[in-house]
């Protein structure tokens, strides 16, 4: 199933090599290419606890870890200026909109119960604004905002209970939405969730330093999406005929020498390490890669002969995260003394390789600019022509079967551990005004203009 | 090449705590691809894992032991060490400690083992 | 009582073939790696076979070992005085967090 990845390094003559009449190609995307942009909810929707909506662990890691952010009250506001957003969506030309539904505004507590209406009412809104305007939503059920509650009470995806929990939530969702929604993510790059969340401390809920407690949390990530595909495929693509999949985020590298093995076997392992972790089970063979069975064998859960069975094969696509939050900081272990690379191209060979060409939705990538920048974004402009003219490459060239983009973001907002230092926005957005206007960067104007022309014009 | 070397006392009174240091050549405790390891065999008997411990300060013990293992690294004198709380008689065996290995590519498994000291819990 | 079972003993003659089973679960041979380690009289252990089948520098081919789903296999052809040992087969168990090791088996060469 899996190790071809490794012939990207070694410049396996199948490999188109990038010369110097394909440092930037002239050309259009395929016929309809699924061009989108992408919010999450915590990122963009401020009103924290407004309208009954229950705090989620980011919520509480804000106000104990983020000592100068004093909440996302502030953030963008979507949860208020919907409209707003619809606007720039319009104004964008996008084929669909990837955005997140906050569980605790459904679920204040995270337990399937009686939705909060509010709620309800806003993501239903949202859904049908997007199937008016001929946006096709692509919704992801967890993008990190996990009702405190269910942390308190459980320790969060640390204990399998949740799995079964998040399904309840999933369920819920496929019926509510699921007449609108053809395109599904369960979640959004697990690696980051417990790489950050449970390893280095740096995102929700902060703990750290256990590596057991890190695996664990990836293996019930794991079993979680398997749990919502199965749960799909079974109750509701039948009548939905929709897609589902996992958003698995990486980073890049390169050999300190490139053509030394022992560096080209690092640089295997460091993408096993992050990004064949989850896609293994998932898009491969149904287990861990053997490389980190054998060297994580005392922290790493394993799978039963059943649960490979079940893990295999539940993602309808692959969709694929490459930007900042997989580069800064990377972890030691991941790098493993060779360089980091931002050649998305690359990666996009490697994952045709490693999983057996599977069709992928780049469903985050972009770049971030400093909070002081407002609308004259040109490092972004630069990071996205560069980042597009790696995937046209992939597709033309190597023939890789990438069908749809995700620009990140829409819309400044919250970043993470980053707080509002930087901004990933196409739209602009002053915090500390009261209307929350969306300005549209030069990104904005130029990303228009990509999807108006299908790529790049001579 | 690597070698280890256990020390400690051979006489141990019962409900005392057994405590014993191996002491590292040929490679350095604080290495990622190594778990620092103990493990005894009583007169006559198989061998039975204690415990071991990883460079970054984790640890595992074999579970019907934990409650009287402790398993630490001394980077500054490349040591380890394993202490052994409220012994009795069936604690008597002798005492090897281990590099324990895996790394991406193959799992050694105990690689490398001392010579063993043997310790006797008697008044 | 071992989490690995071992036959207690095996015999034969010089020159003849030999194995010995160890047979575990899924949680420990079926989803882990298996050494195998020599134990002469009156000596420490030692590494005769890693990651199921694979042999360290100096030690000669005539050992070899297997696994299949929650059993693995050492066996030794061609054998020699100098075998006569004790053979303990070793992985990780996933359920106990623990190195577990089989209970041993004598070899007798006859």
């Known amino acids: 199933f899996s190790g071809d990845g490794r012939a990207i390094w070694s410049k396996n003559p199948n490999f188109t090599p990038v010369n110097e009449s394909q440092l930037f190609l002239y050309d259009t995307f395929p016929k309809n290419f699924f061009w989108g942009i992408g919010t999450g909810a915590l990122q963009v929707e401020g009103s924290w606890k407004k309208d009954g909506k229950g705090p989620s662990i980011w919520d509480h890691f804000i106000h104990t870890h983020l000592k100068n952010v004093s909440s996302t009250n502030g953030s963008s506001d979507s949860y208020i200026f919907l409209e707003k957003d619809l606007s720039a969506l319009d104004f964008i030309g996008v084929s669909f909109y990837q955005f997140s539904i906050s569980w605790p505004r459904l679920f204040p507590d995270g337990i399937v119960t009686v939705a909060n209406a509010k709620g309800l009412q806003y993501y239903s809104t949202l859904l049908d604004a997007l199937v008016l305007r001929n946006i096709e939503p692509i919704v992801t059920l967890y993008h990190w905002d996990l009702p405190l509650a269910l942390q308190e009470k459980y320790g969060g995806w640390k204990n399998d209970t949740i799995i079964d929990i998040f399904n309840d939530y999933a369920t819920y969702c496929f019926q509510m939405f699921g007449d609108r929604v053809k395109y599904w993510i369960t979640i959004h790059n697990p690696y980051l969730v417990a790489w950050h969340g449970y390893g280095t401390g740096m995102h929700a809920p902060g703990e750290k330093g256990n590596l057991a407690a890190v695996y664990t949390v990836g293996h019930n990530l794991i079993k979680a999406h398997s749990k919502v595909w199965h749960n799909y495929n079974t109750h509701f693509r039948p009548h939905q005929k929709g897609w589902l999949s996992i958003t698995l985020g990486s980073h890049w590298i390169e050999p300190n020498r490139s053509e030394n093995t022992m560096d080209i076997f690092k640089c295997q392992q460091s993408m096993v390490s992050v990004l064949g972790w989850f896609a293994n089970p998932i898009h491969g063979d149904g287990d861990y890669p053997e490389g980190m069975r054998k060297k994580l064998f005392s922290v790493l859960p394993i799978f039963s002969e059943a649960e490979k069975h079940e893990m295999r094969g539940t993602a309808d696509f692959f969709a694929f995260s490459f930007g900042p939050n997989n580069f800064k900081p990377l972890n030691t272990m991941a790098k493993m003394g060779q360089n980091v690379s931002l050649n998305l191209r690359e990666a996009l060979n490697w994952i045709k390789l490693e999983y057996n060409n599977p069709r992928i939705l780049i469903a985050e990538n972009g770049w971030f600019t400093d909070s002081r920048v407002k609308t004259e974004d040109t490092t972004a402009i630069y990071m996205m022509k560069n980042f597009l003219s790696q995937v046209l490459q992939a597709i033309r060239l190597d023939e890789i079967r990438v069908f749809g983009y995700t620009a990140w973001s829409l819309l400044d907002g919250f970043e993470w551990q980053d707080a509002y230092t930087i901004r990933r926005g196409l739209f602009y957005v002053d915090f500390n005004s009261k209307q929350k206007e969306r300005k549209p960067k030069s990104s904005a104007h130029y990303y228009k203009q990509i999807i108006r022309e299908n790529g790049f014009s001579l | 090449q690597v070698q280890l070397q256990e020390s400690g006392p051979g006489l141990v009174k019962p409900s005392e705590t057994l405590s014993l240091t191996c002491t590292v050549s040929g490679d350095s405790v604080s290495s990622g691809d190594n778990y620092w390891s103990w493990i005894r065999q009583p007169p006559g008997k198989g061998l039975e894992w204690i415990g071991f411990?990883?460079?970054?300060?984790?640890?595992n013990y074999n579970p019907s032991l934990k409650s009287r293992v402790t398993i630490s690294l001394h980077t500054s004198k490349n040591q380890f060490s394993l202490r052994l709380s409220s012994v009795t008689a069936a604690d008597t065996a002798v005492y090897y400690c281990?590099?324990?290995?895996?790394?991406?590519?193959?799992?050694?498994?105990?690689?490398?083992w001392g010579q063993g000291t043997t310790v006797t819990v008697s008044s | 009582q071992s989490v690995l079972t071992q036959p207690p003993s095996v015999s034969a003659a010089p020159g003849q073939k030999v194995t010995i089973s160890c047979s575990g679960s899924s949680s420990n041979i079926g989803n882990n790696y298996v050494s195998w380690y020599q134990q002469l009289p009156g000596t420490a252990p030692k590494l005769l076979i890693y990651?199921?089948?694979k042999r360290p520098s100096g030690i000669p081919d005539r050992f070899s070992g297997s696994k299949s789903g929650t059993s693995a296999t050492l066996g030794i052809t061609g054998l020699q005085t100098e075998d006569e040992a004790d053979y303990y087969c070793?992985?990780?168990?996933?359920?106990?967090?623990?190195?577990?090791f089989g209970g041993g088996t004598k070899l007798t060469v006859l």
């Open positions: 990651d199921n089948n």
């Open positions: 070793g992985t990780w168990d996933s359920s106990l967090s623990a190195v577990v």
């Open positions: 411990m990883f460079y970054s300060g984790s640890t």
């Open positions: 281990g590099r324990y290995r895996s790394d991406w590519d193959y799992y050694y498994g105990m690689d490398v």
